[in-house]
Every structure is written in structure tokens, then in C-alpha cells.
């Protein structure tokens, strides 16, 4: 059962991956990003269900083609470094999903934008925090 | 000093066209974004679109997204809003507003919406 | 869309009193520039709104330092030391850490 310090650990650790998250689509969604119409047209994958931890493994695999994307933001406006920020987000997602049960993601027929990504896993992440607190 | 004056507002019918001006002075109005937004009577501010500096890249609110059309003329100082499809909501004051600087390097400063016009009234009624 | 929502509503207040006005979000807007860009705004009856505050707490030129904005993250607030005659109307939280959105607006008139 967890305790209320591993109940405390999780929530700080979705703080920060909602935070990071948040972060990301700010720099992104904003008519100042000259990359924005060229952004929008990758797509992604969208998790069948979203609903506990373990269903963070749908975020892990994205990450990589995130990072891809995010690559094409860097300018003097977009401050993050793509590869730091996407490293900090997997170590967080591997800590909250766990590594103890392998977890095959089942993805939705219908691909995303990155914005429809980002704000997706932003309310994953505010569901839970709700149920932690 | 900073002026922005709009024109063109009026009563329109639904389903039919208006044109919407703001005149700019008093700054460099190439190296700025501009903006435009309304305020339907007794009711908030809602954005409405945005072009930036040398017109490449023009955003719209979904309410407008296909009937309304930002454009910009840096050779006259002046910012337009073509309205297609006029519908009844669409009833409003219309400003202009400044948006943010860009340097020569496509790098922005300084804070949107930091000066704004007087307005200009759209009705939209049968 | 980012929701920006103010309380209250409505302000009666007294001459030379304080006044606070809050606006919450519904997204973080810290951007990825570290900026956070919430500003607030001042529209008289009549005229069109004015900047008043802009990234939380940077006035904007010629606003008296009666005005004060502070906030972080989600949780903004913008304080009137002593309310004098001129500062009746509506005053608005936006943002633009992503594409614009205004808060509904709290009006503040003298009691």
C-alpha cells in the first residue's frame, strides 16, 4: 500500500512533469513561435486510455519524436534545450510508471498535433494530481 | 506619440462583407505585430487575430478562423481585418492593439498590447 | 485555450482604500522563455482598455505606483494602494504565454 510520503514523492514528481509539460506548449502555442504552422503538421500518438500511472509508458514512447519537434522551435525565444528537457522528462515518467510491469501502449486510431499532445497529457497529469490530493 | 486609429466599422447585414482599417503612427509599424480585438456591447475582450511584423504569419481566433482575414500595408502604416460572413455575434467594438517588437533577427522584446485605438463599432443586423 | 478567470466580479470601494483583484489560470504560464506574460488591463467607461501591468509586476509607463501586480505560476493579483476617483472601470487579466486569452473582467466603483 502506499505511504504518505511515496503519495507525497508522486505528487511532486507530476507537479514537475506537469510543469515541464505546461512549459512546452507555452513556448510552442504562441503566435511568437515562428515554427508554429510547420510544427502543427507532425503527428502523434494518443493514448487509447489514460488513466493510471503505467499508462505514462504511451508518453515515454513519444518522447523521442517530441524532441525531434521541439528541435525545430530553437531560436533566441525558445530557451530549453530540447535533449536536457526531454532527458528530465524521462527520467520522471520512468519513476512514476515504474519498471517493475512491462505495460504494451494501445494508442488511439486518430493521430495528434503537438498541441493536442501536450494538452493531453497536461490533463493526465492534473487528473491524477486530483486523486493524490 | 503611439496612435492607432480604426475605420470602416458600420451596420451590415447578416452573410454580407466589411472591411475594417488601423492607421498606425508614431512608431516603427514594420517592426511590430499587431493585433486586433473586440468587445461585443456591455461584454469582455475577446482576441480576435494577430499578424506579425512582415504579415508572413497570421493567426485567428477559432470564432473567425475562414470568414476573417488580417493583413497589414507597412508601406502606408496601416492594418486591415476583412470580415467575411458577418453574423449577428460578430456585433462588436473593434480595436487594434500593438504587439511586440522584432529586431532584425526575427527576435521579439517589449509587451503586447501595450498601445490600443479608440475603436470602431460593427453591427451586424437585418 | 487557457481560462482566465477573476474574482470578483463586482468591487464596491471607498475612496483612499485599498482594492485587490484576482485572476487565476487555468494552465501554468511560465513560458519557455522564463517570461511569465501576465498583464493586467484598465478600461474606462467609454474608452478602449489601457496597459496597466505587464510579466505579473512591471508597470508600464506613466501607471501610478499605486498599481501592484504579483503572482506566480497560476495565482495573480493585481492591488490598488489607495483608490482614487480615475481608477473606476473594468480591469482585465490576460495572457499571452500562448495565443491571447482575457479573464471576464472585474468592475470597480466607489461605494
Known amino acids: 500500500a502506499p505511504t504518505s510520503s511515496s503519495t507525497k514523492k508522486t505528487q511532486l514528481q507530476l507537479e514537475h512533469l506537469l510543469l515541464d509539460l505546461q512549459m512546452i506548449l507555452n513556448g510552442i502555442n504562441n503566435y511568437k513561435n515562428p515554427k508554429l504552422t510547420r510544427m502543427l503538421t507532425f503527428k502523434f500518438y494518443m493514448p487509447k486510455k489514460a488513466t493510471e500511472l503505467k499508462h505514462l509508458q504511451c508518453l515515454e514512447e513519444e518522447l523521442k519524436p517530441l524532441e525531434e519537434v521541439l528541435n525545430l522551435a530553437q531560436s533566441k525565444n525558445f530557451h530549453l534545450r530540447p535533449r536536457d528537457l526531454i532527458s528530465n522528462i524521462n527520467v520522471i515518467v520512468l519513476e512514476l510508471k515504474g519498471s517493475e510491469t512491462t505495460f504494451m501502449c494501445e494508442y488511439a486510431d486518430e493521430t495528434a498535433t503537438i498541441v493536442e499532445f501536450l494538452n493531453r497529457w497536461i490533463t493526465f497529469c492534473q487528473s491524477i494530481i486530483s486523486t493524490l490530493t | 506619440q503611439v496612435q492607432l486609429v480604426e475605420s470602416g466599422g458600420g451596420v451590415v447585414q447578416p452573410g454580407r462583407s466589411l472591411r475594417l482599417s488601423c492607421a498606425a503612427s508614431?512608431?516603427?509599424?514594420?517592426?511590430?505585430?499587431m493585433h486586433w480585438v473586440r468587445q461585443a456591447p456591455g461584454k469582455g475582450l475577446e482576441w480576435v487575430a494577430v499578424?506579425?511584423?512582415?504579415?508572413?504569419?497570421?493567426y485567428y481566433a477559432d470564432s473567425v478562423k475562414g470568414r476573417f482575414t488580417i493583413s497589414r500595408d507597412n508601406s502606408k502604416n496601416t492594418l486591415y481585418l476583412q470580415m467575411n460572413s458577418l453574423r449577428a455575434e460578430d456585433t462588436a467594438v473593434y480595436y487594434c492593439?500593438?504587439?511586440?517588437?522584432?529586431?532584425?533577427?526575427?527576435?521579439?522584446?517589449?509587451?503586447?498590447?501595450?498601445?490600443w485605438g479608440q475603436g470602431t463599432l460593427v453591427t451586424v443586423s437585418s | 485555450d487557457i481560462v482566465m478567470t477573476q474574482t470578483p466580479l463586482s468591487s464596491p470601494v471607498t475612496l483612499g482604500q485599498p482594492a485587490s483583484i484576482s485572476c487565476r489560470s487555468s494552465?501554468?504560464?511560465?513560458?519557455?522563455?522564463?517570461?511569465?506574460?501576465l498583464s493586467w488591463l484598465h478600461q474606462r467607461p467609454g474608452q478602449p482598455p489601457r496597459l496597466l501591468i505587464y510579466?505579473?509586476?512591471n508597470r508600464f509607463s506613466g501607471v501610478p505606483d499605486r498599481f501592484s501586480g504579483s503572482g506566480a505560476g497560476t495565482d495573480f493579483t493585481l492591488k490598488i494602494s489607495r483608490v482614487e476617483a480615475e481608477d473606476v472601470g473594468v480591469y482585465y487579466c490576460?495572457?499571452?504565454?500562448?495565443?491571447?486569452?482575457f479573464g471576464g473582467g472585474t468592475k470597480v466603483e466607489i461605494k
Open positions: 492593439a500593438r504587439g511586440s517588437y522584432y529586431d532584425s533577427s526575427g527576435y521579439y522584446y517589449g509587451e503586447d498590447f501595450d498601445y
Open positions: 508614431g512608431f516603427t509599424f514594420s517592426t511590430y505585430a
Open positions: 499578424i506579425w511584423y512582415d504579415g508572413i504569419n497570421k
Open positions: 494552465h501554468n504560464l511560465i513560458h519557455s522563455d522564463g517570461n511569465t506574460y
Open positions: 510579466k505579473i509586476s
Open positions: 490576460m495572457q499571452t504565454s500562448q495565443f491571447p486569452t
